[in-house]
Interface confidence: low
Amino acid sequence: ASTGETPNLGEVVVAEVGWDALKLNWTAPEGAYEYFFIQVQEADTVEAAQNLTVPGGLRSTDLPGLKAATHYTITIRGVTQDFSTTPLSVEVLTASGLNDIFEAQKIEWHEGTHHHHHH
């Protein structure tokens, strides 16, 4: 078990949204996590979440295989060998057409408070 306190994630940003994919960026202290666990859940359905793990050195990933014009909740956790951070979530609506790309809302995490930033 770790002796020190593992810091939480900083912020998560949906950087790009397409009709069937999106790009997720996040911040985290360097070297704090072995990997990140990402769940992509279609909102308002009982469909199983899509799960993805990415190495702890990454701060960005593409999330393919989504449906167009659909609300998703994306949750990310930083994971060490014996610790998982508080989950950080962002909601996003995928684009309705192939060329409909926009920058989505940005959500920051500050000690249990969500701050919403619209661009």
Partner: antibody, heavy 121, light 107 residues
């Protein structure tokens, strides 16, 4: 010291299912991924899938998708692998392995003793 | 899936020999590669992780190298207990894939 203890050998009929257990002791169970790896007689090692008990969600190799179910019971620190629609080519030693590193498909640093599953009519 | 091509598939060597086994990945996997030793009827045992880091308790005669697509496991001076089958494992991209194994036999 981490130990993974698997259930005993099984003999199954083609078309049936088998469920193998893997009980972990030592270390934290929930946050470590447990993978299942199989080895057919005289063959190499093959990753089947894995689970991180804290999340309860499993990940499977394409080859086994739809036929394998991996679960974990945090209360007993036990992971399970169930393989259905068994055929003769599923005859193998099945290992559970605890991972170090990147979740489901990290480098395996602790292994169970293996469970021999024989599929024969 | 990433293909891991391991060579040679078998080799004969004598105690004291220097032995090198190679693993080639079909695409770049950074340094996300481990090496395992397996003896008949036993579970595999990890020797090397992250391409070149020695697993705790493993003798220093074992060493790993490489990154990207080309990796090596070297046994600097083969000992009687080293006769076994060795596997590489890539864990950079899912699904994890093993090389087909290299059997090290006594000459």
């Amino acid at each position: 010291q981490v130990q993974l203890v698997q259930s005993g050998a099984e003999v199954k009929k083609p078309g049936s299912s088998v469920k193998v257990s893997c009980k972990a002791s030592g270390g934290t169970f929930s946050s470590y991924a447990i993978s299942w790896v199989r080895q057919a007689p005289g063959q190499g090692l093959e990753w089947m899938g894995g689970i991180i008990p804290i999340f309860g969600t499993a990940n499977y190799a394409q080859k086994f998708q739809g036929r394998v179910t991996i679960t974990a019971d945090k209360s007993t620190s036990t992971a399970y692998m169930e393989l259905s629609s068994l055929r003769s080519e599923d005859t193998a030693v099945y290992y559970c392995a605890r991972l170090y590193g990147y979740a489901y498909y990290g480098a395996f640093d602790y292994w169970g003793q293996g469970t021999t599953v024989t599929v024969s009519s | 899936d990433i293909q891991m091509t391991q060579s040679p598939s078998s080799l004969s060597a004598s105690v004291g020999d220097r032995v090198t086994i190679t693993c080639r990945a079909s695409q770049g996997i950074r340094n996300d590669l481990g090496w395992y030793q397996q003896k008949p009827g036993k579970a595999p045992k990890r020797l090397i992780y992250a391409a070149s880091s020695l697993q705790s308790g493993v003798p220093s005669r074992f060493s790993g190298g490489g990154s990207g697509t080309e990796f090596t496991l070297t046994i600097s001076s083969l000992q009687p207990e080293d006769f076994a089958t060795y596997y590489c494992l890539q864990n950079g991209l899912q699904p994890a894939t093993f090389g087909q194994g290299t059997k090290v036999e006594i000459k």
